[in-house]
C-alpha cells in the first residue's frame, strides 16, 4: 500500500558539512516499527546513503559506520547527514516503510535538494 511522505524541497548544509531535514509520513495506522532509507539521486544515478529501523518513540538505529543520525517524534523523522562535501550535493530522498503491525505501507518522498559548499581555506596569517 502506498503512503504519502513529505520532506523540504531545499536544505543548505552547514560550513561543517552537516545537513538536517525532517521526513514526515502520513501514517494510516499506528505503526510500531518503521524502516527509513535515505537515497541520493545525482546525475540520474540513485545510491543508498543510509538506512535505519526504529521502534516508535525510540532513536533510529543506523549501522556503525553510517554518516546519518536521527530521531523520531510521532510521524516525523529528524535526519542529520554529516561529513558532506561539495561533491555530495544532490537530491536526498526519504523512503519510509511501516513494517509492523500489518498492513505494510511504503512511501517515497519527492526529495530534498541538499547544497553543500566547501569552506574556503583560511588564508595564512603572518
Amino acid at each position: 500500500k502506498a503512503m504519502h511522505v513529505a520532506q523540504p524541497a531545499v536544505v543548505l548544509a552547514s560550513s561543517r558539512g552537516i545537513a538536517s531535514f525532517v521526513c514526515e509520513y502520513a501514517s494510516p495506522g499506528k505503526a510500531t516499527e518503521v524502516r527509513v532509507t535515505v537515497l541520493r539521486q545525482a546525475d540520474s544515478q540513485v545510491t543508498e546513503v543510509c538506512a535505519a529501523t526504529y521502534m516508535m518513540g525510540n532513536e533510529l538505529t543506523f549501522l556503525d559506520d553510517s554518516i546519518c543520525t536521527g530521531t523520531s517524534s510521532g510521524n516525523q523523522v529528524n535526519l542529520t547527514i554529516q561529513g558532506l562535501r561539495a561533491m555530495d550535493t544532490g537530491l536526498y530522498i526519504c523512503k519510509v516503510e511501516l513494517m509492523y503491525p500489518p498492513p505494510y505501507y511504503l512511501g517515497i518522498g519527492n526529495g530534498t535538494q541538499i547544497y553543500v559548499i566547501d569552506p574556503e581555506p583560511c588564508p595564512d596569517s603572518d
Partner: nanobody, 119 residues
Framework: KVQLVESGGGLVQAGGSLRLSCAAP????????MGWFRQAPGKGREFVAD????????YYADSVKGRFTVSRDNAKNTVYLQMNSLKPEDTAVYYC????????????WGQGTQVTVSS
C-alpha cells in the same frame, strides 16, 4: 512484465519446516530487492523478510526472527525463504515480491502459496 513464481507451500505440523522458493524465469534480479510477505484470512498484508540482491543484506520481521531465513541463488535467479519451528500463527498465503529499483515500491508480485501449520 516480471513473472514471479512461488513454490514450496503446503501443510505442516507445528514445529516443522518448509522452504519456499521464488523464481523469475529468464529475468535477472541484479537491481532488485526481493521480499516475502504473508496474508492471513481477514488480516492485512504483513512484511516477513527481504534481501537486497546486490549485497545480500537481509531484514526480518520480529515475529519470524531466528526462525526464518531468506537467501538468494544468483545462478538460479531464485530467492528462498527457509521457515523453521513453524507455529499455527504462521498460517497464511505467502507472497514473493520484487522491487524494480531503489526508488521503486514492490512492483512485482507472485501469485502466492498457501502455508498451513496445524497444531
Amino acid at each position: 512484465k516480471v513473472q514471479l513464481v512461488e513454490s514450496g507451500g503446503g501443510l505442516v505440523q507445528a514445529g516443522g519446516s518448509l522452504r519456499l522458493s521464488c523464481a523469475a524465469p529468464g529475468r535477472t534480479f541484479s537491481n532488485y530487492a526481493m521480499g516475502w510477505f504473508r496474508q492471513a484470512p481477514g488480516k492485512g498484508r504483513e512484511f516477513v523478510a527481504d534481501i537486497r540482491w546486490s549485497d545480500g543484506r537481509t531484514y526480518y520481521a520480529d515475529s519470524v526472527k531466528g526462525r526464518f531465513t531468506v537467501s538468494r541463488d544468483n545462478a538460479k535467479n531464485t530467492v528462498y525463504l527457509q521457515m523453521n519451528s513453524l507455529k499455527p500463527e504462521d498460517t497464511a498465503v505467502y507472497y514473493c515480491a520484487a522491487q524494480g529499483g531503489v526508488l521503486s515500491g514492490w512492483d512485482y508480485w507472485g501469485q502466492g502459496t498457501q502455508v498451513t501449520v496445524s497444531s
